[in-house]
Amino acid sequence: MRRGPRSLRGRDAPAPTPCVPAECFDLLVRHCVACGLLRTPRPKPAGASSPAPRTALQPQESVGAGAGEAALPLPGLL
């Protein structure tokens, strides 16, 4: 099952300033905003073909991923 990349930590850009909890990094304005202001993903209907991405981009935390599978961005912030 394909999954999203681990975080927004950059290959070609520096990691953004970490957001405080309940804030998310908005790539278009390049600063942290309340997560509720961004159209974060909803759970998909049963039987959907792939998992919904987590809610936010968060460079400073990570969780382990299974073999051949990258972890998704974590909830909270970028």
Epitope: P5, G10, D12, F25, L38
Partner: antibody, heavy 118, light 111 residues
Framework: QVQLQESGPGLVKPSQTLSLTCTVS????????WNWIRQHPGKGLEYIGY???????YYNPSLKSRVTISRDTSKNQFSLKLSSVTAADTAVYYC????????????WGQGTLVTVSS | DIVMTQSPSSLSASVGDRVTITCRAS??????????MNWFQQKPGKAPKLLIY???NLGSGVPSRFSGSGSGTDFTLTISSLQPEDFATYYC?????????FGQGTKVEIK
């Protein structure tokens, strides 16, 4: 389920202003980014611009001098105005909204054809 | 603006064929470890439908025969076994920076 529906005149005269509205259900336009895209007949997709959760706007530089995007949060609608239209503005106009954090447009209106002709 | 170039512009294929469409960006669309590359399917008279986001993630309800790969500037959309409902036009699009830009499209026709 988020749904978007475009509405507005299907025929506009040259030099006049094209006005379209996108009505959103299933989500609030005070969250996320709300976009306009157009497609000329038989051609590819062209990005017009957005209005954001805060009401800030971005317009494609190729159209910036003629475009205004606004919103009415009480009706959960956002609108496109394109001034001084010519036949080259004849297109199907779509409203769409991207997901977060990937900014991929996963919700689209069905599109509305606007013809510019006298 | 980031220019997206798709190839081929059209192709003819048969049901069951493996189909590959490529897209090249004029500059990297990677940022913060994400490839901001998306693929859409469009059928005549219909709005585009999101197939793949962030280079390799399936959109909601998209069959697993569709897959995406790539990073940086070079990306691929693959249909592992073409089905009758897959005859359509496919567009790549970058969402790294505005103005968001699209490829010119690849029309997949019946051979």
């Amino acid at each position: 389920q988020v749904q978007l529906q475009e509405s507005g005149p299907g025929l506009v005269k040259p030099s006049q202003t094209l006005s379209l509205t996108c009505t959103v259900s299933g989500d609030s336009i005070t969250s996320g980014y709300w976009n306009w895209i157009r497609q000329h007949p038989g051609k590819g997709l062209e990005y017009i611009g957005y209005i954001s959760y805060s009401g800030s706007t971005y317009y494609n530089p190729s159209l910036k001098s003629r475009v205004t995007i606004s919103r009415d949060t009480s009706k959960n609608q956002f609108s496109l105005k394109l001034s001084s239209v010519t036949a080259a503005d004849t297109a199907v106009y779509y409203c769409a909204s991207p997901n977060y954090p990937f900014y991929a447009m996963d919700y689209w209106g069905q599109g509305t054809l606007v013809t510019v002709s006298s | 603006d980031i220019v997206m170039t798709q190839s081929p512009s059209s192709l003819s294929a048969s049901v069951g064929d493996r189909v590959t469409i490529t897209c090249r960006a004029s500059e990297s669309v990677d940022n913060y470890g994400i490839s901001f590359m998306n693929w859409f399917q469009q059928k005549p008279g219909k709005a585009p439908k999101l197939l793949i986001y962030a280079a390799s993630n399936l959109g909601s309800g998209v069959p697993s025969r569709f897959s995406g790969s790539g990073s940086g500037t070079d990306f691929t959309l693959t249909i592992s076994s073409l089905q009758p409902e897959d005859f359509a036009t496919y567009y790549c699009q970058q969402s790294k920076e505005v103005p968001w830009t699209f490829g010119q499209g690849t029309k997949v026709e019946i051979k």
